[in-house]
C-alpha cells in the first residue's frame, strides 16, 4: 500500500502518457486522477510501466470501482489484467 501524500506542485498528471514512468510510486498515487486513468486505460498498455508501478495503478482503479470494474475499463486492461485476482474478476459484471 502506497502512503497517501499530497501531489507536489506541477506534477498533477494532465494525461496518461510516457512521462509517468518517471514518477515514484507515491507520486503516481498522489498525482494521477483515478477517473482520468479509467478513461485513458487504452494508453497504459503502450507505456513501459514497471510491475510495481502497475500495482499503484491497479490500486487506484480498485478505489474508484470497489464493486468491480465497468466493461469500458475491463476491455482495456491489457497488462494490468495480469494483476487481477480471482476475487477481482468475480466482481466484474461482463455481458
Amino acid at each position: 500500500e502506497v502512503e497517501k501524500t499530497a501531489c507536489p506542485s506541477g506534477k498533477k498528471a494532465p494525461e496518461i502518457d510516457e512521462s509517468l514512468i518517471f514518477y515514484k510510486k507515491w507520486e503516481l498515487e498522489a498525482c494521477v486522477d483515478a477517473a482520468l486513468l479509467a478513461t485513458q486505460m487504452d494508453r497504459v498498455n503502450a507505456i513501459p510501466f514497471t510491475y510495481e508501478q502497475l500495482d499503484v495503478l491497479k490500486h487506484k482503479l480498485d478505489e474508484l470501482y470497489p464493486q468491480g470494474y465497468p466493461e469500458s475499463v475491463i476491455q482495456h486492461l491489457g497488462y494490468l489484467f495480469l494483476k487481477m485476482s480471482p476475487e477481482d474478476i468475480r466482481k466484474w459484471n461482463v455481458t
Epitope: 510516457e18 498498455n45 513501459p48 510501466f49 510491475y51 497488462y79
Partner: nanobody
Framework: QVQLVESGGGLVQPGGSLRLSCAAS????????VAWYRQAPGKEREAVAV???????KYADSVKGRFTISRYNAKNIAYLQMNSLKPEDTAVYYC??????????WGQGTQVTVSS
C-alpha cells in the same frame, strides 16, 4: 521468450561519456516504446529515458540535457548516450518494453560506475 541484452557499461571518470546498447532477440521494438532504467545499490529501480514508437523522447529530470535515447528498429537495438556523467549516475542500467516491465522480466543489465 524475448531476451534483452544490455552492454556498453564500464568505469568512467566524472564528466565522461558512455553509450549503452540494448539488443532484443525478437522484433519487439518496432511498434513499442522502449525505456532505459537504472538501479543503484539499495535503491528502487527508476526510469531515466523513454522513446515512443513514434520516436518521441522523454527524460527524468535528473538526466535531462545529459542523456539521449535513440533506437534503430531495423536491427532491434536501442541506445542510451550518456554525457557529463556524475557519481550519482552509478547504477546497473536496464532497458525494457511495456511487456517485459509489466511481468517484471529484465535482462542482466550493464554496470555503470562513475568515479575518479
Amino acid at each position: 521468450q524475448v531476451q534483452l541484452v544490455e552492454s556498453g557499461g564500464g568505469l568512467v571518470q566524472p564528466g565522461g561519456s558512455l553509450r549503452l546498447s540494448c539488443a532484443a532477440s525478437g522484433s519487439i521494438f518496432s511498434g513499442n516504446a522502449v525505456a532505459w532504467y537504472r538501479q543503484a545499490p539499495g535503491k528502487e529501480r527508476e526510469a531515466v529515458a523513454v522513446i515512443t514508437r513514434d520516436g518521441d523522447t522523454k527524460y527524468a529530470d535528473s538526466v535531462k540535457g545529459r542523456f539521449t535515447i535513440s533506437r534503430y528498429n531495423a536491427k532491434n537495438i536501442a541506445y542510451l548516450q550518456m554525457n557529463s556523467l556524475k557519481p550519482e549516475d552509478t547504477a546497473v542500467y536496464y532497458c525494457n518494453t511495456a511487456r517485459g516491465a509489466a511481468v517484471d522480466s529484465w535482462g542482466q543489465g550493464t554496470q555503470v560506475t562513475v568515479s575518479s
